[in-house]
C-alpha cells in the first residue's frame, strides 16, 4: 500500500525534513506550507493550522517561496540616469540599469548602484576597448598611420587616405590632405574595426575636462578638473 | 574634499617585498583611473603604473614591469601596489595620484602626501 | 620611449620677474601636456593641462602654450610662494615621463 500522504501541518518523522515548500516551525514543531512568490505569511501555522498567506501590498513583493511575516520592499524608482528594465511587481523588484551611453561603474546585488556616463576618447585617441554595460571605453593614441579627428565613445582610429600627391601629411588627430586626384583608403595597422559598444547611443555630451563640476553628477564632487560624469545612486 | 592617503612604506632587503595601499575618499572612486608615481630621495618625478576605473586596463614602467602590480578594490575605495624583487634603486617617496582619464582627460589632478619606501640591506 | 628635454635645470629670478620654462618631447604629443609645481617636502600640484588649460584654483600669472613637440610654461610676475620645481609630463604613449624639472630660486 501507499504511504498515507500527510498534510501541512504535520510532525515530521524524527531525523527528517519537511517536504519541497514546506518549511520547519520551531515553535509548533510541525512542518507547514510555505507561501508562493507574491505573498508572505499573515499567521503562522500552528499544531492544528496551517500558515495562512496574504498578498504583498503595493510596491512591495517576494520572490521566493517564504514564510517571511512582511514582504520586501521594492527599491526606489530608478534615477535620471537609468532606465527601469524590471518593474516592481508582487513577485519581483525593481532593477535598473544604466542607460545608452552609460555604464554601470558600481554593481548591486541587482541592478546598478552607481552609472557613469562612458568616456570619449579625444581627437588623437581612438577607441581601443569599446564601452560595455558594466565597464567604462579604453581609449588609445592612434598609430603612426592612422587618425581620430573626433570626441566620441565609439569612434576608433581610422587609416589615413593615400594620396597620389599629398597636400598636407596626415597625424594622429588629423587625415591626410590629398591634392584634387581622387584618394584611397590606406589599411594602416591598428585600424581593424571593434565591434559596436552595448550601451553608447547617447545624447549627453562628455563633460570637458574643465575646471568645474561634471554636469549630471549628483554626487558632492570637488570643483576642479573631474572627467566622469556619474549619476545619482540607484538605491 | 578629495583625499588620497598612502600607507605600507617602509625598510625592506634588496629582494623583499612590500605592498601599498591608497585609500581614496571625496569623490566616486570607481568611475576614475588611478596610478602610482614616485620620487627618489633629491631626483625628480617617475610615473610607475596605471590603472583604469574598472581595473580592466593596466600600464606599467618598463623599470617596474613583472615586479610590481597595480590592483583596486573598487567597493573598498582602495588602490594597491604589489611591489617584488625589490632593488635599491625602488627607493623613494611613493604617490598614490588621481588620472589620468587616459585618452579624455590627460593630467593628474590629486595627489596623496606620499609614503617613504627605502630597500636597503 | 618619448624623451621630455626641460629647461633650465635651474634658474635665479627676483619677485617680479616674468619667467619661462620650455619643455621639448622627441616627438608629438598633440598638447597632451600638464605642467606641476612642486615645494619642498610637499606633494606636486596640478598647474595647467592640455598644454594651455589653467587648473582649477591657480593664479593668472601662470600660462602654458605650445604644441606639437615644444611647450612653455610661463609665470608673468614670479611672486614669492613661487619658488618651487616646476615639471612637465607627457600623456601621449606609455611610458608617460616626466621632464627632469626647472628648480626656480630667489636671486
Known amino acids: 500500500l501507499p504511504a498515507q500522504v500527510a498534510f501541512t501541518p504535520y510532525a515530521p518523522e524524527p531525523g527528517g525534513t519537511c517536504r519541497l515548500r514546506e518549511y520547519y516551525d520551531q515553535t509548533a514543531q510541525m512542518c507547514c506550507s510555505k507561501c508562493p512568490p507574491g505573498q508572505h505569511a499573515k499567521v503562522f501555522c500552528t499544531k492544528t493550522s496551517d500558515t495562512v498567506c496574504d498578498s504583498c501590498e503595493d510596491s512591495t513583493y517576494t520572490q521566493l517561496w517564504n514564510w517571511v511575516p512582511e514582504c520586501l520592499s521594492c527599491g526606489s524608482r530608478c534615477s535620471s540616469d537609468q532606465v527601469e528594465t524590471q518593474a516592481c511587481t508582487r513577485e519581483q523588484n525593481r532593477i535598473c540599469t544604466c542607460r545608452p551611453g552609460w555604464y554601470c561603474a558600481l554593481s548591486k546585488q541587482e541592478g546598478c548602484r552607481l552609472c557613469a556616463q562612458l568616456r570619449k576618447c579625444r581627437p588623437g585617441f581612438g577607441v581601443a576597448r569599446p564601452g560595455t554595460e558594466t565597464s567604462d571605453v579604453v581609449c588609445k593614441p592612434c598609430a603612426p598611420g592612422t587618425f581620430s579627428n573626433t570626441t566620441s565613445s565609439t569612434d576608433i582610429c581610422r587609416p589615413h587616405q593615400i594620396c597620389h600627391v599629398v597636400a598636407i601629411p596626415g597625424n594622429a588627430s588629423m587625415d591626410a590632405v590629398c591634392t584634387s586626384t581622387s584618394p584611397t583608403r590606406s589599411m594602416a595597422p591598428g585600424a581593424v574595426h571593434l565591434p559596436q559598444p552595448v550601451s553608447t547611443r547617447s545624447q549627453h555630451t562628455q563633460p570637458t575636462p574643465a575646471p568645474s563640476t561634471a554636469p549630471g553628477t549628483s554626487f558632492l564632487l570637488p570643483v576642479g578638473p573631474s572627467p566622469p560624469a556619474e549619476g545619482s545612486t540607484g538605491d | 574634499e578629495v583625499q588620497l592617503v598612502e600607507s605600507g612604506g617602509g625598510l625592506v632587503q634588496p629582494g623583499g617585498s612590500l605592498r601599498l595601499s591608497c585609500a581614496a575618499s571625496?569623490?566616486?572612486?570607481?568611475?576614475?583611473?588611478l596610478s602610482w608615481v614616485r620620487q627618489a630621495p633629491g631626483k625628480g618625478l617617475e610615473w610607475v603604473a596605471y590603472i583604469n576605473n574598472g581595473g580592466i586596463s593596466t600600464y606599467y614602467s618598463d623599470t617596474v614591469k613583472g615586479r610590481f602590480t597595480i590592483s583596486r578594490d573598487n567597493a573598498k575605495n582602495t588602490l594597491y601596489l604589489q611591489m617584488n624583487s625589490l632593488r635599491a634603486e625602488d627607493t623613494a617617496v611613493y604617490y598614490c595620484?588621481?588620472?589620468?582619464?587616459?585618452?579624455?582627460?590627460?593630467?593628474?589632478?590629486?595627489w596623496g602626501q606620499g609614503t617613504l619606501v627605502t630597500v636597503s640591506s | 620611449d618619448i624623451q621630455m628635454t626641460q629647461s633650465p635645470s635651474s634658474l635665479s629670478a627676483s619677485v617680479g620677474d616674468r619667467v619661462t620654462i620650455t619643455c621639448r618631447t622627441s616627438?608629438?604629443?598633440?598638447?597632451?601636456l600638464p605642467w606641476y609645481q612642486q615645494k619642498p617636502g610637499k606633494s606636486p600640484k596640478l598647474l595647467v593641462y592640455d598644454a594651455t588649460k589653467l587648473a582649477e584654483g591657480v593664479p593668472s600669472r601662470f600660462s602654458g602654450s605650445g604644441s606639437g613637440t615644444d611647450y612653455t610654461l610661463t609665470i608673468s610676475s614670479l611672486q614669492p610662494e613661487d619658488f618651487a620645481t616646476y615639471y612637465c609630463q607627457h600623456f601621449w604613449v606609455t611610458p608617460w615621463t616626466f621632464g627632469q624639472g626647472t628648480k626656480v630660486e630667489i636671486k
Open positions: 616627438e608629438s604629443i598633440y598638447s597632451n
Open positions: 595620484v588621481r588620472g589620468p582619464f587616459y585618452g579624455s582627460a590627460n593630467y593628474f589632478d590629486y
Open positions: 571625496g569623490f566616486a572612486f570607481s568611475t576614475y583611473d
